[in-house]
């Protein structure tokens, strides 16, 4: 196409655009570590900052980690996008009782209207059903099973919604995790972890339950409650969450119903040894960034030690004195070797005594 | 999304060595560090190594001066050279993007690729 040739010289002679012979355009070359919003920016606003997978770029202009939708009662109502998070929502027969930022911490079943009471509203994802009166003289049809059960607490407008958990009879008709189901039985059969914190010293009939919620007439829709700090796992037992409470851990999702609380490292860490919904091991995260390091070229020649900084904190980049040692202390699993044309080693102190409390393992 | 592929691994004698090698796609591969993980049977997963953009390297002690991190930017991949293999290496071995932001909990096994297992067996 010899008139796009005017056009494409003119792009060759501006060091920041490039031609785009694709849609034969002018376009703005994003700088470095920027990356277009589209096939052909044209200025600068069309470039962004590049989010890792289920990551995306909040107002602030940060990474941040879209919100998971993987508990069993949760699903996906918008998909993790560059410019915001996914957003869970509760799965069809459930509404958010406690919501979360872009998700919900806690769904309980919709209200099934008792006797004599009939569908107002329908429940959705957000709200219970309503229950109202049915017109005087008229007797539910009880066609629908729903609108013959007894009522769990008085003739009420709002039935109380039970909360959801794989135990329950509703949850059992329903695939739960791979396909598999949870049998009532389960929910007779629940134990807890050993020795978790937060249950010392509560008496308890059966310790890790909370005291069994009375079922409503005519209806299997109840079950027993792990006690707080304590979440119901795949085989139906009352397993201790674990604790974030080290120094060097930060909580990155709740203690849920159904799913253990999960820790990470707090910012400027990284995990050197994974443990089950936790990290056994934090260590300062050992590499600088870039435009941090201070270090003269002429140095790289020497070895160096560079010194761990106190717990959590990042590595500050300078180099020790010269024959600065690494401290007498550091065991053969607690250090990385710092590698840049010379060796250089980072001793890492390890993290507080590790003492998760999640299965007991 | 970015999809990281592992390959490489196989089995080796102690003492032998193996090259792994982790490719991605070019959109982020230029800008973020990059690390080695590895997980043992029934252990947890243990940082191996990482390397920054501009090359410079880190190693767990376990594998200093066996262990050799490398990046072909061009090629959008990373290396694990692994020499003097012992049996205590035997591990599945993922790489892992951007561990500064990614890895702070007990994830960076398996989160984008498969991994390649790594067996020291006579």
């Known amino acids: 196409f010899p008139q796009d040739r005017p056009f494409e010289d003119t792009c060759h002679g501006n060091p920041s655009h490039y031609y785009d012979k694709a849609v034969r355009r002018c376009c703005y070359r994003c700088p470095m570590g920027l990356f277009p919003t589209q096939q052909c920016p044209q200025r600068p606003t069309d470039c962004r900052k590049q989010c890792e997978p289920d990551y995306y770029l909040d107002e602030a202009d940060r990474c941040t980690a879209c919100v998971t939708c993987s508990r069993d009662d949760l699903v996906e109502k918008t998909p993790c996008a560059w410019n915001s998070s996914r957003v869970c929502e509760c799965r069809p027969g459930m509404f958010c009782s406690t919501s979360a930022v872009n998700s919900c911490a806690r769904c309980f079943f919709h209200s099934v209207c008792p006797a004599g009471m009939i569908v107002k509203f329908p429940g959705t994802a957000q709200k219970n059903t309503v229950c109202e009166p049915a017109s005087p003289g008229v007797s539910p049809a009880c066609a629908s099973p729903e609108n013959c059960k007894e009522p769990s607490s008085g003739t009420i407008p709002q039935a109380k919604p039970t909360p959801v958990s794989p135990a329950t009879s509703s949850a059992s008709t329903m695939p739960v995790r791979g396909g598999t189901r949870l049998a009532q039985e389960a929910a007779s059969k629940l134990t807890r972890a050993p020795d978790s914190p937060s249950s010392v010293g509560r008496p308890s009939s059966d310790p890790g339950l909370s005291p069994t919620q009375p079922c409503p007439e005519g209806s299997g829709d109840c079950r027993k409650q792990c006690e707080p700090d304590y979440y119901l796992d795949e085989a139906g037992r009352c397993t201790a969450c674990v604790s974030c409470s080290r120094d060097d851990l930060v909580e990155k999702t709740p203690c849920a119903w159904n799913s253990s609380r999960t820790c990470e490292c707090r910012p400027g860490m990284i995990c050197a040894t994974s443990a089950t919904n936790s990290c056994a091991r934090c260590v300062p995260y050992p590499i600088c960034a870039a435009e941090t390091v201070t270090k003269p070229q002429d140095m790289a020649e020497k070895d160096t030690t560079f010194e761990a900084p106190p717990l959590g904190t990042q590595p500050d980049c300078n180099p020790t004195p010269e024959n600065g040692e690494a401290p007498a202390s550091t065991s053969p699993t607690q250090s990385l070797l710092v590698d840049s044309q010379a060796s250089k080693t980072l001793p890492i102190p390890t993290s507080a005594p590790v003492a998760l409390s999640s299965t007991g393992k | 999304e970015v999809q990281l592929v592992e390959s490489g691994g196989g089995l080796v004698q102690p003492g032998g060595s193996l090259r792994l090698s982790c490719a991605t796609s070019?959109?982020?591969?230029?800008?973020?560090?990059m690390a080695w993980y590895r997980q043992a049977p029934g252990k947890g997963c243990e940082l191996v190594s990482i390397?920054?953009?501009?090359?410079?390297?880190y190693y767990a002690d376990s594998v200093k001066g066996r262990f050799t991190i490398s990046r072909d930017n061009s090629k959008n991949t990373v290396y694990l050279q692994m020499n003097s293999l012992r049996a205590e290496d035997t591990a599945v071995y993922y790489c892992a993007l951007d561990p500064r932001k990614n890895c702070r909990g007990g994830y960076c096994c398996a989160n984008w690729g498969q991994g390649t297992l790594v067996t020291v067996s006579s």
């Open positions: 390397i920054s953009a501009d090359g410079r390297t």
């Open positions: 070019a959109f982020t591969f230029d800008g973020p560090d």
